[in-house]
């Protein structure tokens, strides 16, 4: 595939990644599909000039990003660690609540009206941020 | 690499007491809902208490209600279970679990008159 | 409580075969089953989450299936390193519970 070196059409250019910002609400492993077949993933934050940057385009609405821990630990879905990473929980959070009465507790990640971080129903229909990094190889063929 | 040790099992006599710990290292222990579960000998698992990530959200099996607490230390990345007037049925191993995904080697408990 | 009925509670089979194992809720617990295998003086070891979801690490010769109060965990080309317990377990609400085991042995 061909590098991609600007933005599709409707996504934002910032610091040589592309980002897009949904106005609907889908479950998270439907949003984490919609931006798999954009050959992107959920947005991954990586540092807090990142996160103050994504908290700026989406308010104070809860809004899906790329962090689970659905099969035991947390884990960012481009493999970045953890760990080590970058972390912005609300106070008390994430704290896996059974009390919702959905079953199961809380096992994904979102941004809250406060831009701070929270675990959550998988299901809920939040809205979502897809992000691809310039300069990685595109899936589509090369224009001749 | 994620690892939980579990110590402060022994004998103890009907009617006593003991504090189990379980250290933890090589993951972010404050993220996680931590959980104990105890095997009797030769017998199955059996949940026995969970604790959320800030110590909000306890719970506990019917048969430790009242005589088992639960707490942790995020700051000594360190999951305790305190057991009072213990009984001859708790003799078991005391498992300590991060969530539902890992698993310490457990902690032998044993009450005997 | 639910109740986690599994079944059965223990069962021979050789080097090379294809077991099944089931696992029963007694409500609906939709997709929140763990698997796990636990071998003599080890701790349990995570197999399945979500029912069908394999744990990293896991070899593709163990399969969850099942949504709501059925499940069955399968293991194909049975291995001497297989020969070990079984749970199933969920976790759709407190009180979590465990099956009872399976012990699957060498015939």
């Known amino acids: 595939g061909s590098e991609r070196t600007c933005c599709p059409v409707n996504w934002v250019e910032h610091e040589r990644s592309c980002y897009w910002f949904s106005r609907s609400g889908k479950a998270w492993a439907d949003a984490d599909n919609y931006c798999r077949l954009e050959d992107a993933h959920l947005v991954v934050v990586t540092s807090w000039e990142e996160q103050k940057f994504v908290q700026h385009h989406i308010g104070p609405v809860n809004t899906w990003m790329g962090l689970h821990d659905q099969n035991g630990p947390w884990k960012w879905v481009d493999g970045t660690d953890y760990e080590t990473g970058f972390k912005n929980w609300r106070p008390e959070q994430p704290d896996d609540w059974y009390g919702h009465g959905l079953g199961g507790g809380e096992d994904c990640a979102h941004f809250t009206d406060d831009g701070r971080w929270n675990d959550d129903v998988c299901q809920r229909p939040y809205r979502w941020v897809c992000e691809t990094e310039l300069d990685k190889a595109s899936q589509e063929p090369p224009l001749l | 690499e994620v690892q939980l040790v579990e110590s402060g099992g022994g004998l103890v006599k009907p009617g006593g007491s003991l504090r189990l710990s379980c250290a933890a290292s090589?993951?972010?222990?404050?993220?996680?809902?931590m959980n104990w579960v105890r095997q009797a000998p030769g017998k199955g698992l059996e949940w026995v208490s969970s604790?959320?990530?800030?110590?909000?959200?306890?719970d506990y099996a019917d048969s430790v209600k009242g005589r088992f607490t639960i707490s942790r230390d995020n700051a000594k990345n360190s999951l305790y279970l305190q057991m009072n007037s213990l009984r001859a049925e708790d003799t078991a191993l005391y498992y300590c679990?991060?969530?539902?995904?890992?698993w310490g080697q457990g902690t032998l408990v044993s009450v005997s008159s | 409580d639910i109740q986690m009925t599994q079944s059965p509670s223990s069962l021979f089979a050789s080097v090379g075969d294809r077991v099944t194992i089931t696992c029963r809720a007694s409500q609906d617990i939709s997709n929140y089953l763990i698997w796990f295998q636990q071998k003599p003086g080890k701790a349990p070891k995570s197999l399945i989450y979500?029912?069908?979801s394999l744990q990293s690490g896991v070899p593709s010769k163990f399969s969850g299936s099942g949504f709501g109060t059925d499940f069955t965990l399968t293991i194909s080309n049975l291995q001497p390193e297989d020969f070990a317990t079984y749970y199933c377990q969920q976790y759709h609400s407190f009180p979590l519970t465990f099956g009872g085991g399976t012990r699957v042995e060498i015939r």
């Open positions: 979500t029912a069908s």
């Open positions: 604790i959320s990530s800030s110590s909000n959200h306890i």
């Open positions: 679990a991060r969530g539902t995904d890992y």
């Open positions: 090589g993951f972010t222990f404050n993220s996680y809902r």
